[in-house]
């Protein structure tokens, strides 16, 4: 599944059928440069955009409605949580219901938890709102499990 | 390995500004948020705000807002933070602290600069 | 803005015994509080991250535990080294805030 990289601006299409996938983080440009075996945590976050309607376009990633939104969204993404820890985001679908978007989003592990990823999304909506004219709300996030991820030991250092 | 190494003591007088600065190093500093927090003699830890170096964004406790401005020089992996119109509340010593986000936690903290507002 | 609470302001202990410090937050956090020690004249050291998140190179006889709105700092067998201010912080909202912190002590 195309994936958006965190050290990339460039953004390639997502499928919105398959499920998620693991970013290639050896194309990380940060300066410790994350690998599997730090590990990575996962997290499935959905939310509602309240002014914009879902209609069959957003079904077929080849349309300008389903790549400029999801391009808005990518970018959208990378300023919420910069660099740092996060990896990038996968697999973006879009459902009926206004528009609801669900992704999922990778970091490197022991950096965040899902209380600070709620958070710190929930702290961008209004800069979204300005920024992309999109009305945000309804905002889930919760773990992902992966059965590959490094479990938690010693931090990570931050 | 990571380290924040912070300017010398300063000491102004009321009225004045200050600008202390934090050198950093062994990590890509654009791609770290870097945080200021203020401790007064004897006191606690206060939260000023934040810089992020990639592109300048910045947030800030609202206590702070006007008083404080950060920022940052990519080229020397620097940051700023500017202290104006000081009083003598000001006098504490000003921690840079590296984070991973928005919010979280601090692992890597510089040495702290003590500036001291006397007339 | 979230308030942190601690106490106690001041812990007395004998070395070798176990020490708890808590701290209580205005509103749920969820688990998004991180402990923090300062010795005198030095920087704050992180210590646990997330409530119970270890630290790489802290002692295993500091430990976290908790979620919404209490949390505790536990200290399993305390040590001479240990003397220091001990501070929690959340990271669940702007501002970001800081408890005054507990200050232990040695008898």
């Known amino acids: 599944t195309p994936t958006t990289l965190a050290s990339h601006s460039t953004k390639t299409d997502a499928s919105s059928t398959h499920h998620s996938s693991v970013p290639p983080l050896t194309s990380s440009n940060h300066s410790t440069s994350p690998q599997l075996s730090t590990g990575v945590s996962f997290f499935f976050l959905s939310f509602h955009i309240s002014n914009l309607q879902f209609n069959s376009s957003l079904e077929d990633p080849s349309t300008d409605y389903y790549q400029e939104l999801q391009r808005d969204i990518s970018e959208m993404f990378l300023q919420i949580y910069k660099q740092g820890g996060f990896l990038g985001l996968s697999n973006i679908k879009f459902r009926p219901g206004s528009v609801v978007v669900q992704l999922t989003l990778a970091f490197r592990e022991g950096t965040i938890n899902v209380h600070d990823v709620e958070t710190q999304f929930n702290q961008y909506k209004t800069e979204a709102a300005s920024r992309y004219n999109l009305t945000i709300s309804d905002v889930s996030v919760s773990d992902v499990p992966f059965p590959f991820s490094a479990q938690s030991g010693a931090g990570v250092p931050g | 390995q990571v380290q924040l190494v912070q300017s010398g003591a300063e000491v102004k007088k009321p009225g004045s500004s200050v600008k202390i600065s934090c050198k950093t190093s062994?990590?890509?500093?654009?791609?770290?948020?870097m945080n200021w927090v203020k401790q007064r003699p004897g006191q606690g830890l206060e939260w000023i705000g934040q810089?992020?170096?990639?592109?300048?964004?910045?947030n800030y406790n609202g206590k702070f807002k006007g008083r404080a401005t950060l920022t940052a020089d990519k080229s020397s992996s620097t940051a700023y933070m500017e202290l104006s119109s000081l009083r003598s509340e000001a006098t504490a010593v000003y921690f840079c602290?590296?984070?991973?986000?928005?919010?979280?936690?601090?692992?890597?903290w510089g040495q702290g600069t003590l500036v001291t507002v006397s007339s | 803005e979230i308030l942190l609470t601690q106490s106690p302001d001041f812990q007395s202990v004998t070395p070798k015994e176990k020490v708890t410090f808590t701290c209580r937050a205005s509103?749920?956090?969820?688990?998004?509080i991180h402990w923090y020690q300062q010795k005198p004249n030095q920087s704050p050291k992180l210590l646990i991250k997330?409530?119970?998140e270890s630290i790489s190179g802290v002692p295993s006889r500091f430990s976290g535990s908790g979620s919404g709105t209490d949390f505790t700092l536990t200290i399993n067998s305390v040590e001479s080294e240990d003397i220091a201010d001990y501070y929690c912080?959340?990271?669940?909202?702007?501002?970001?805030?800081f408890g005054q912190g507990t200050k232990l002590e040695i008898k």
């Open positions: 810089i992020y170096p990639g592109d300048g964004d910045t």
């Open positions: 912080q959340q990271s669940n909202n702007w501002p970001l805030t």
């Open positions: 997330y409530a119970s």
């Open positions: 602290a590296r984070s991973y986000y928005r919010s979280a936690w601090f692992a890597y």
């Open positions: 509103q749920s956090i969820g688990t998004s």
């Open positions: 062994g990590y890509a500093f654009s791609n770290f948020w």
